[in-house]
C-alpha cells in the first residue's frame, strides 16, 4: 500500500501581471468526500500559508473572498492560480492535500513549485 502521492510542476513563471497558475494532482488512497488544499510558501526554513480551501468532491473549490488564490477542481486534480505576485514573492510554493472526511485522514505534500516573478519594467515616458 503506497502513501498518497501529490504531483505539481517543478517550475512556473508568473505572467507580467503577477499571475501564476499550476496544477496540483494527488493519488488518493481512500474515497474522500471532503478535501482540503493548502498552498504554502517555503523560504529558507520558514513555511507560511498562502491560501487554503476545502471542497466536497464534485463541487467547486472556494477560497475566502480576500484570498490571493483561485482554483477549480476536477476529480483528483486542482488547478490553482495565485495572483498579485511581485518579484519579492519568488519562491517555492508547496501544494498540501489533506483528505479530511470520511476517516481516516490522509496527508500528502508535493515537492513544491518554484515560482519566478519578474516585476515589469516601468513604461518609459514618451515625448509627443
Amino acid at each position: 500500500c503506497k502513501a498518497m502521492h501529490v504531483a505539481q510542476p517543478a517550475v512556473v513563471l508568473a505572467s507580467s501581471r503577477g499571475i501564476a497558475s499550476f496544477v496540483c494532482e494527488y493519488a488518493s488512497p481512500g474515497k474522500a468526500t471532503e478535501v482540503r488544499v493548502t498552498v504554502l510558501r517555503q523560504a529558507d526554513s520558514q513555511v507560511t500559508e498562502v491560501c487554503a480551501a476545502t471542497y466536497m468532491m464534485g463541487n467547486e473549490l472556494t477560497f475566502l473572498d480576500d484570498s490571493i488564490c483561485t482554483g477549480t477542481s476536477s476529480g483528483n486534480q486542482v488547478n490553482l492560480t495565485i495572483q498579485g505576485l511581485r518579484a519579492m514573492d519568488t519562491g517555492l510554493y508547496i501544494c498540501k492535500v489533506e483528505l479530511m472526511y470520511p476517516p481516516p485522514y490522509y496527508l500528502g505534500i508535493g515537492n513544491g513549485t518554484q515560482i519566478y516573478v519578474i516585476d515589469p519594467e516601468p513604461c518609459p515616458d514618451s515625448d509627443f
Epitope: L40, E49, K96, M100, P104, L107, I109
Partner: antibody, heavy 119, light 107 residues
Framework: QVQLVESGGGVVQPGRSLRLSCAAS????????MHWVRQAPGKGLEWVAV????????HYADSVKGRFTISRDNSKNTLYLQMNSLRAEDTAVYYC????????????WGQGTLVAVSS | DIQMTQSPSSLSASVGDRVTITCRAS??????LNWYQQKPGKAPKLLIY???SLQSGVPSRFSGSGSGTDFTLTISSLQPEDFATYYC?????????FGPGTKVDIK
C-alpha cells in the same frame, strides 16, 4: 513565542466527566491542527484526538471514540477535551500539542495535566 | 490503522557510543515520520521530523533516515544528557500512532 498551557486535570471517579483546556498563544491558532496525546503512568505515548482548523473535522483514537469530544474556540485560542464515562485506564498525563503546518509533527507541547480516575 | 514498531525496546550504552534505533511502519508512510525524546516527568521533545530533518536547536549528533516503512534514528556519539526514552510517530494518517518507545540507559 509559542505557548500551550493545559488545565482541568484532577482526580475523578469512574463514570464521571472532566473537561481539559489548553490555552494557546504566540501563533495563528486557526491555521493549525491541534492534538491531544496522553501517557499512562510508566507507559508510552498514545495519540488521543485531533481537531482541524475551523473545528469542523475531528478524529479520535478507538479507545476514546464515543466518550471523548475534542473542540476548539478559535476566538479564544483555546482547545478542549470533554471526557465522559471515564475509566481507570484513562488515567494519564494529557498533553496538548500543535501539529506542524506542513508535515504535522509536534514541535510544541504543553506541560501536561494529570487525570486520575479512581474510586 | 498503521502500527509502529520499534527496536530495541531498551538498550544500555556508554558515553561516546554510537546508538541506532529502528522504527517500522505496518504500511508505507512516505517520509511522515517523526522522532521524539522524553525524559521522566517532562513533555516529549521533537528531535527529527519528516524522517530526516533536524529540528532547530537539536544537536547534530542526532540524525534520521529512511522512507516508506523503515526508519532509523542515530546518535553518533552518546552524551550524558541523551539518556532518555525515544519514540517514533507517524503523521501520515489517523490514528497518528507512536512506536512503543526505546529506553536508552547507562551501561
Amino acid at each position: 513565542q509559542v505557548q500551550l498551557v493545559e488545565s482541568g486535570g484532577g482526580v475523578v471517579q469512574p463514570g464521571r466527566s472532566l473537561r481539559l483546556s489548553c490555552a494557546a498563544s504566540g501563533f495563528t491558532f486557526s491555521s493549525y491542527g491541534m492534538h491531544w496525546v496522553r501517557q499512562a503512568p510508566g507507559k508510552g505515548l498514545e495519540w488521543v484526538a485531533v481537531i482541524w482548523y475551523d473545528g469542523n473535522n475531528k478524529h479520535y483514537a478507538d479507545s476514546v471514540k464515543g466518550r471523548f469530544t475534542i473542540s476548539r474556540d478559535n476566538s479564544k485560542n483555546t482547545l478542549y477535551l470533554q471526557m465522559n464515562s471515564l475509566r481507570a485506564e484513562d488515567t494519564a498525563v494529557y498533553y496538548c500539542a500543535r501539529g506542524d503546518m506542513l508535515t504535522g509533527y509536534y514541535g510544541y507541547w504543553g506541560q501536561g495535566t494529570l487525570v486520575a480516575v479512581s474510586s | 490503522d498503521i502500527q509502529m514498531t520499534q527496536s530495541p525496546s531498551s538498550l544500555s550504552a556508554s558515553v561516546g557510543d554510537r546508538v541506532t534505533i529502528t522504527c517500522r511502519a505496518s504500511q508505507s508512510i512516505s517520509s511522515y515520520l517523526n522522532w521524539y525524546q522524553q525524559k521522566p516527568g517532562k513533555a516529549p521533545k521533537l528531535l527529527i521530523y519528516a524522517a530526516s530533518s533536524l529540528q532547530s536547536g537539536v544537536p547534530s549528533r542526532f540524525s534520521g533516515s529512511g522512507s516508506g516503512t523503515d526508519f532509523t534514528l542515530t546518535i553518533s556519539s552518546l552524551q550524558p544528557e541523551d539518556f532518555a526514552t525515544y519514540y517514533c510517530q507517524q503523521s501520515y494518517s489517523t490514528p497518528f500512532t507512536f512506536g512503543p518507545g526505546t529506553k536508552v540507559d547507562i551501561k
